[in-house]
Structures are given as structure tokens and as C-alpha cells.
């Protein structure tokens, strides 16, 4: 709130802008007839120093010259970089109560001369873009510093533009707004940047370049692809480019891929043939351009073209399996299953499957199409049957896959030996076996088949299977394997016209069952007791049950109970025991055991046998 210098003036020597480390003399002078009334000798001039509007020092002790009551000179040293405000005030010493009156003020800026600008680089984006140059200004000067960018070319012209740096903005880039023309492609241009402030000036070294050095072409645009004769593997990529482009780089990849296919194309003129595409695959295509074969810069990548290649007829063969069930003495139900082709084999959207069942000798043929991956038919039990399946998309069908329908477990001599199932981790099971001992025909392949042992799984869920070559004796099964679930696993050995199988149960992880079996009835027959139960609900089994235990003891007895251990069979739900005394009341219960341990006991039932006991 200074009434601007009404009472006097403040001057700075050598200047209000000084280099770092220099001293300055500040003189404060009162105008004629200003000062303390009646007592000029009582005029006392004081100098206050402010940084960021905060009073930091009273320079009373820095007076170097004094004309009593008229002017004073103060020396200031050790000023920090940036701006410092000095305010001269008049203190009338005979009036202690009045505060000092502001006379005038001055700002002193401390800084450094600019360093020569370095690392100049210039770019023109596209043939019709404008030249923009950037540089490194060096150390901050703490002063307003003007920068002039000057560009001299081959046509006797010099272009220049200015900007400045201060404590609010930084100037290290300028767009000249000038467009260099391609007809000057080989010509040399010289650019330099000059920096000037109150403490000095400096100039960069001249930086020389050609049109080709600095022009970055615009990325190609209007990208499209034309598939020759609707081919899924060959296509012509087309795009628009700036006129001077001589080199293109193409990159393309399937959308789910992590690595690009790269192609360099010279003088492509906006067209390139690709021959190695995968049919019915989502691809991403991008293109970059360059104006010179050896020099210059690549453009940014174009926007992506995303498109799907056309379909081609399926290749590969379907993996088929089947189940046979006798319905009555002369009919059987055949259920065929097959796995979907993987995308590289399907080469399109599979519209349907062509299924054929053929009786070899009578030449009876059943044919159908289905959109599902299974098919069931009832056929006579007589005759030798063969099945074939092929997959069809909009472009055609795959070669049919044939399988002979044999009695899968009909030949005991073909049954694999020593089948075992070991849990490997949470979601897979290692199945191992030994080959059949006395097979009268060679094993052509093994099939490992598995399904969850849950109610209705045979009808509700298709089987899972793996084809194993005849010289392998193990399989790691993982598809649809979940922990705490028991699976029935069959290993089939197939020859040309026969099959043998062995079965085992297995799980990938197990716990003790949640509960024991529920005893539903105890009946007495011919001096034996029959215990009947219901199996533990499937979710509570928590793995493969190895055996059940039936416990009994006399009511109110504190002795250890007796027990009978029964090998678990899914079909069995009753068991006789014969060591109970007649006319003694017993308490009975059951538990179930997995590889992880025994369940809590199931319900308790009391029973008093009536007949003679052995």
C-alpha cells in the first residue's frame, strides 16, 4: 500500500537486476519539502527487506552513506536468486507513537545470464505440417529470458519466432508455423536459438538438418483389407499414404496374440499382399511410413484395422468316443460323443455335424445331422457297426472320422492291469496301468474315460476321455476335475475289433466325509441282523469313500464298541452281522472313511435281537 513515491525516490546501483553474488547500493532520497515537519534533522530513513511479501530484515545497520534528514544509502549483499522487495520508510523520531511512513520501494532481481541452448531438435509432422523445434535451456536464470528461434534455408529466407521464460512459464519449444516443402528434400537448413536477459546473452551452436531428417510422415490412414476370392489365408492390405513415402512397415497379429508379425515393404504404393493369415481369426493390422530408405523417421503407427478373416473348410479329425447300453435281448443304445474342433481346425463357425452309423455286412446306414456334440440311436445288437462324424462350416466339411463300435469291456484278456489313480494336486489325477497280459490282438490305443460319481451322472453328463498311444501307460487327467469329488475312471484297451477295460475310483483332493451313512432299518433273518442304510449325500462325501464301518455296543456299556468294516460298493446298501447276543439291547451306528479319515458317526439305532445268536 505505497502511495507511489510521493515522498521521495529509491534508486539502485549498479542496476535493479544483478548477478548472483553481487552487492547493490540502494539510495533512498526525500523529495524537497517532504519529511518530518519542522525538524528535518529528525528525519530517519530506514530500509526494510521483504521476500514473498514477508518482512525478513531491517537494514538499519547496512547504511553506508547518510545525508542527515535528506537521503541514505544502504549496501545489500548475499541476495538470494529471484526477486526481493526493498521498501524505504521515514521514521520521525520525535514522535514515538506514529509508525514509519512509506517513502518508495524497489524490486531487485538476482539471476544468472542464460547458458547457450543445447540439444536442439526439430520435427515437422507430415508433408503439410509445420516445423517445431525444442531445446534444452540449461540452468534456470531466475530472470525473464527471451528466446529467439531462427531458421535459415536454401531459399535466402530466415524465419524467426520468439518466446520467453519467467517464473510462471518455461520456453523450450516453438512451432514456427512454417511448412517445409518436399521439393527441398535434399536441401540443408540451419537452426539456432539465442537467449537474452538483462545479464547477458548466449547462442546455441547452429544445428543443420535436411527436410528428410525432420519430417515425420503422418501415419497411414483409411486402412482396409480385401480377401482374394474370399480366401481366409490371403488378403491384400490397402491404405492411403503421403505422396513422398517410400517405405512402409506392416505389423499384424491375431487379437489374442502377444507378438506381432512384422513386414517391410518398399515402394508399396499403399498395397501389400499377405499370404500367411489364419482363417476365421480376428486380426489387428497397423502400418507405419518413412520418407527415405536409409534416413528419416518412422511415422507413428496407424490406427488399428481390426477384422476377421473369412472361413475355410474345417481340417483335422474329430475325437470320437461312444457308450453302449443293452436295452433288451436284441436292441442296444449307442451314444456317440465327440470333442469340438479347436479354432485353428474348425476355421469357421461349425454349423452342424454329419453323423453316420453303418452296419458293415448288411450295409444298413443311419445318417443324421446335429448341432450338438453327441448323438444317440437304438440299433440291433447283431452285426458289426461302425460310426463316422464330420464337422461342417459355411465353406465345407472336414474329412469324416471313423470308429468301430465294439463291446468296450467285452474281452477280459484285453483288460489293462494294475490300474491306479493318484491325486497330483487340486485339479488333476494321475492314472497309471500295465498292459493286458495275454491279449490275443494288438492294442491299438488306450482310452482313459472318467465321470463324476454323482446321481444321474451317466444320463446327465457326457463322459470325459483322453486318447493315449499304445506305448504309453499313464495319463494325467485334468478336464473337469474338481477337488473333493470322486470320479469313476476306466482305462479301455482297444484293438481293431475288441475292447477290454478296468475300472478304478479316484479323486484329486479329499477330506473326511461331513457325515456318516444314515441307518434306515435293522432286520433279523435266520439268526443274522441286516443293517440297511442310505448313502451319504454326494456333496458331503468329499472324495472317494473307501469303506463303511458299522459300530455296535450294548446299551449303557462304557466298553469300546465293536466294528465291522465293509469295502465300499455303490450298489450295496445293506450288510449282515452275526455276533450279537439275543435279548440284549444294542446301539448301532455307521461311519464312512476316505483317504483323509473317518466321518463323524451317523444316526444311532437301538435294536434287540430276538433269535438265537451264533
Amino acid at each position: 500500500n505505497i502511495d507511489v513515491c510521493k515522498l521521495g525516490t529509491v534508486t539502485v546501483q549498479p542496476a535493479p537486476v544483478i548477478p548472483l553474488g553481487s552487492a547493490a547500493n540502494i539510495s533512498c532520497s526525500l523529495n524537497p519539502k517532504q519529511g518530518c515537519s519542522h525538524y528535518p534533522s529528525s528525519n530517519e530513513l530506514i530500509l526494510l527487506k521483504f521476500v514473498n511479501d514477508v518482512l525478513v530484515e531491517n537494514l538499519h545497520g547496512k547504511k553506508v552513506h547518510d545525508h542527515t534528514g535528506h537521503s541514505s544509502t544502504f549496501q545489500v549483499t548475499n541476495l538470494s536468486l529471484g526477486m526481493t522487495l526493498f521498501v524505504c520508510k521515514l521514521n520521525c523520531s520525535n514522535s514515538q507513537k506514529k509508525p514509519p511512513v512509506p517513502v518508495c520501494g524497489v524490486e531487485i532481481s538476482v539471476g544468472v545470464a542464460p547458458e547457450p541452448p543445447q540439444n536442439i531438435s526439430c520435427v515437422q509432422e507430415g508433408e503439410n505440417g509445420t516445423v517445431a523445434c525444442s531445446w534444452n535451456s540449461g540452468k534456470v536464470t531466475y530472470l525473464k529470458t527471451n528466446y529467439t528461434l531462427q531458421l535459415s534455408g536454401p531459399n535466402n529466407l530466415t524465419c524467426q519466432k520468439q518466446c520467453f521464460s519467467d517464473n510462471r512459464q518455461n520456453c523450450n519449444r516453438l512451432d514456427l508455423g512454417i511448412n517445409l516443402s518436399p521439393d527441398l528434400a535434399e536441401s540443408r537448413f540451419i537452426v539456432r536459438v539465442t537467449a537474452i536477459n538483462d545479464l547477458g546473452n548466449s547462442s546455441s551452436l547452429p544445428h543443420t538438418f535436411t527436410f528428410l531428417d525432420i519430417v515425420i510422415p503422418l501415419p497411414p490412414w483409411d486402412i482396409r483389407i480385401n480377401f482374394l476370392n474370399a480366401s481366409g489365408s490371403r488378403g491384400t492390405l490397402q491404405w492411403e499414404d503421403e505422396g513422398q513415402v517410400v517405405l512402409n512397415q506392416l505389423r499384424y497379429q491375431p487379437l489374442n496374440s502377444t507378438s506381432w508379425n512384422m513386414v517391410n515393404a518398399t515402394n508399396a504404393k499403399g498395397k501389400y499382399d499377405l499370404r500367411d493369415l489364419r482363417p476365421f481369426t480376428e486380426y489387428e493390422f497397423q502400418i507405419s511410413s518413412k520418407l527415405h530408405l536409409s534416413g528419416g523417421s518412422w511415422s507413428n503407427w496407424s490406427e488399428s484395422l481390426r477384422t476377421r478373416t473369412p472361413e475355410e473348410e474345417p481340417v483335422g479329425i474329430l475325437d470320437i468316443w461312444y457308450m453302449k447300453q443293452d436295452i433288451d435281448y436284441d436292441r442296444q443304445q449307442i451314444s456317440l460323443f465327440w470333442k469340438s474342433l479347436n479354432p485353428s481346425e474348425a476355421r469357421g463357425k461349425i454349423l452342424h455335424y454329419q453323423v453316420t452309423l453303418q452296419e458293415v455286412t448288411k450295409k444298413t446306414t443311419l445318417q443324421n445331422t446335429t448341432r450338438h456334440t453327441s448323438w444317440t440311436r437304438v440299433i440291433p445288437r447283431t452285426g458289426a457297426w461302425t460310426a463316422s462324424v464330420s464337422a461342417a462350416n459355411s465353406k465345407g466339411a472336414s474329412a469324416p472320422t471313423h470308429i468301430n463300435i465294439v463291446d468296450l469291456c467285452g474281452t477280459g484278456l484285453l483288460a489293462p492291469h494294475q490300474v491306479s489313480a493318484k491325486s497330483e494336486n487340486m485339479d488333476n489325477i494321475l492314472v497309471t496301468w500295465q498292459p493286458p497280459k495275454k491279449a490275443d490282438s494288438a492294442v491299438r490305443e488306450y482310452i482313459v474315460e472318467w465321470r463324476a460319481l454323482q446321481p444321474g451322472s451317466i444320463t446327465k453328463f457326457p463322459p470325459h476321455w483322453l486318447r493315449i498311444p499304445p506305448d504309453n501307460m499313464s495319463a494325467l487327467i485334468s478336464e473337469n476335475i474338481k477337488p473333493y469329488i470322486c470320479y469313476e475312471i476306466r482305462v479301455h484297451a482297444l484293438s481293431e475289433s475288441q475292447g477290454g477295460c478296468s475300472s478304478i475310483r479316484g479323486d484329486s483332493k479329499h477330506k473326511a466325509p461331513v457325515s456318516g451313512p444314515h441307518i434306515t432299518a435293522i432286520t433279523e433273518k435266520k439268526e443274522r441282523l441286516f443293517i440297511s442304510w442310505t448313502h451319504i449325500p454326494f456333496p458331503e462325501q468329499r472324495g472317494c469313500i473307501l469303506h463303511y464301518r458299522i459300530y455296535w455296543k450294548e446299551r449303557d456299556s462304557t466298553a469300546q464298541p465293536e466294528l465291522c468294516e465293509i469295502q465300499y460298493r455303490r450298489s450295496q446298501n445293506s450288510h449282515p452281522i452275526s455276533s450279537l447276543q439275543p435279548r440284549v439291547t444294542y446301539v448301532l451306528w455307521m461311519t464312512a472313511v476316505t483317504a483323509a479319515g473317518e466321518s463323524p458317526q451317523g444316526n444311532e439305532r437301538e435294536f434287540c435281537p430276538q433269535g438265537k445268536a451264533n
Epitope: T130, N155, C159, K161, L176, G177, I178, N179, D183, L184
Partner: nanobody, 127 residues
Framework: QVQLQESGGGLVQAGGSLRLSCAAS????????MGWFRQTPGKEREFVAA???????VYANSVKDRFTISRDNAKNTFYLQMHSLKLEDTAVYYC?????????????????????WGQGTQVTVSS
Amino acid sequence: QVQLQESGGGLVQAGGSLRLSCAASGRTFSKSTMGWFRQTPGKEREFVAAITWTDTEVYANSVKDRFTISRDNAKNTFYLQMHSLKLEDTAVYYCAGDRYGSSRDSVFSSPTNYPYWGQGTQVTVSS
């Protein structure tokens, strides 16, 4: 109708200074490139300096570091400050206005790219 009017020419001694002005009327030229050309008898018009609408200054190498072009958009006026004048700077000086504000480097120096012209002002440098 668009008019450009030059002023400030005259007789000056070698080494002296002059400031030419170009006042535009009929349309604003704040988004245009403005140029100064000069012509001596029997010769084609020669490019002297131009200022683009983004304030880039363009100079013929023969006047670089001696002449300064500037603009005052509020007054729709353009200036050419000339220092260290030489005998060969004697000519009629013309102010020219560009319709589009083109940025191609070869455009600034070509008189055919400027559709608007003033009547000219004589500058004579004597020894």
C-alpha cells in the same frame, strides 16, 4: 472493399533508420500472413519480410538483423522497422496481404501468393 495503405517512406542517409506502416481496411488481417516487398525500376518485386498469423517473422537474408517486421492486430496495422539502411535498400516498398495464412515456406516470398497490395511508398537512401 479491401485497402492497404503504406506510409513512413522518405529520404534518409545511409546508416539511418525509417519505420514504414501499413494500415489495412475492409477486412481484418489478424489471421493472415502480411508481407513487405520492394521494387526498383526495371526489376521484379523482391521479397523483404513477412509475419505469419502465428507471429513467426520471415526475412530475406539481405535484410536479416537490420529490419524488423511487427503487427498490431488491434489497429489492423503492420510495420517494418528499418535500421542501418544501405544505398541498395532504395526502392518502392509495398505492403501485401495473404488471403489464407498459408504456412508453406516457399509461399511467403512469392508475390503471386498475396492477393492484396498497397500503392507503395518510396524509400531513398543517400550517401
